[in-house]
């Protein structure tokens, strides 16, 4: 592939589409290739002949959009960075090429948070009271904040508290929610403690 390359910049984890600007219409076949600098040659990602289905020589991370001859990288990764070449052959044998220099950077934003696991233990106290200790866990807890709710009321906003101690009335209705968030997403988990306190004998545990 010759000529200057279009520069395409993306962050990891998102779809990336390489789309040629203007390609003549009488297309007979196309080939998408990626330069392998170590071998000083091209690796065929995908081939397509007009009237047939695309043959994907790499894997299912790539797909081909026939309508505009684009290559779609379904979830770009850093190793997808490099020089890509589209070679279009017309029915008369003429070859047109389009070249793309792709840069995929690790996102500075975190991944979406996963759903937390809310669990705890409790102890029956005298005078019809129940003491509960709740903990809220996510396996990847970098850069996440925690918020606690009793019913719909926010009761704890210290963003780094993964646990909550409460003393409640045995006969009351008690719903607790842990909300975990980061700059791009949030998830929550809710526990209803009413039955646990009423049915418990001295000490008990409750799980989601």
């Amino acid at each position: 592939c010759q000529g200057s390359a279009d520069h395409v910049v993306s962050i990891s984890g998102v779809p990336l589409q390489l789309q040629p600007n203007s390609i003549q219409t009488k297309v007979d076949s196309i080939a998408w290739k990626k330069l392998l600098p170590s071998q000083n040659g091209f690796h065929h990602i995908l081939k397509w002949e007009n009237g047939s289905l695309p043959s994907n020589t790499s894997n299912d991370r790539f797909s081909f959009i026939v309508k505009n001859l684009s290559l779609l990288i379904k979830a770009a990764q850093q190793q997808d960075s490099g020089l890509y070449c589209l070679e279009v052959t017309s029915i008369s044998g003429k070859v047109q090429t389009a070249t793309f220099q792709v840069f995929v950077f690790e996102s500075l934003l975190p991944d979406k948070v996963e759903k937390p696991r809310l669990q705890g233990q409790g102890k029956i106290l005298d005078r019809g009271r129940c003491q509960v200790a709740l903990s809220c866990l996510v396996s990847r807890d970098g850069n996440v904040s925690y918020a606690w709710y009793r019913g719909s009321k926010l009761i704890q906003t210290a963003g780094n508290l993964t646990y909550l101690d409460e003393e409640v009335d045995i006969n009351g209705t008690h719903t607790y929610t842990c909300n975990v968030s980061n700059p791009v997403s949030w998830e929550s988990h809710t526990l209803n403690l009413t039955q646990d306190c009423q049915n418990a004998h001295q000490e008990f545990r409750f799980w989601p």
Epitope: K26, D28, E87, T89, I91, S92, G93, K94, V95
Partner: antibody, heavy 119, light 108 residues
Framework: EVQLQQSGPELVKPGTSVKMSCKAS????????LDWVKQKPGQGLEWIGY????????KYNEKFKGKATLTSDKSSSTVYMDLSSLTSEDSAVYYC????????????WGQGTTLTVSS | DIVMTQSPPIISASLGERVTMTCTAS???????LHWYQQKPGSSPKLWIY???NLASGVPVRFSGSGSGTSYFLTISSMEAEDAATYYC?????????FGGGTKLEIK
Amino acid sequence: EVQLQQSGPELVKPGTSVKMSCKASGYTFTNYVLDWVKQKPGQGLEWIGYINPYNDGIKYNEKFKGKATLTSDKSSSTVYMDLSSLTSEDSAVYYCVRLGYDEDYFDYWGQGTTLTVSS
Amino acid sequence: DIVMTQSPPIISASLGERVTMTCTASSSISSSDLHWYQQKPGSSPKLWIYSTSNLASGVPVRFSGSGSGTSYFLTISSMEAEDAATYYCHQYHRSPPTFGGGTKLEIK
């Protein structure tokens, strides 16, 4: 000046093969597709196939698959056509033609190679 | 394959006469994909008109081309002796490219 210089006339026996050449000059060899066209005596024109010296891309008319084989040599700016298992039906003038750069017309024609197949 | 049919097969025209020949495609083609070639006895064909209406280099302006879809025409406004030849139409809208059977233009 663009020129397509074809090899001379051939008189061959049935069942044999022949290889004719077309030497291109006056332009950048790898920038243009070259086609071959057959014309039987007193008849019309028939497309055989093309070769693109840029990437050695080749396509044949279905009718000539197995009959014609196209090759090219960048070092001498020459394309070749092999015709095999010759019969009297192959007796014709064979033209080497250059495909236009923009639209798909044949802008330059060689002088033709006359092939006569006779026992 | 797209079949190209030229009519009439032979035209006898007087010098100075207006001449029109027709090329009909078996299916619709783009006007940019229809071309005409002139061939004289013992010579190679020459590109004469390309993309329906564009005259090739050196072609006299008395020649013109027109048409669209399946019907295309080559016209000579005033026949001259040097125009006597066979004219072939050619499509490269679909592969394989195909030629008409030719119209032989002779002087009456």
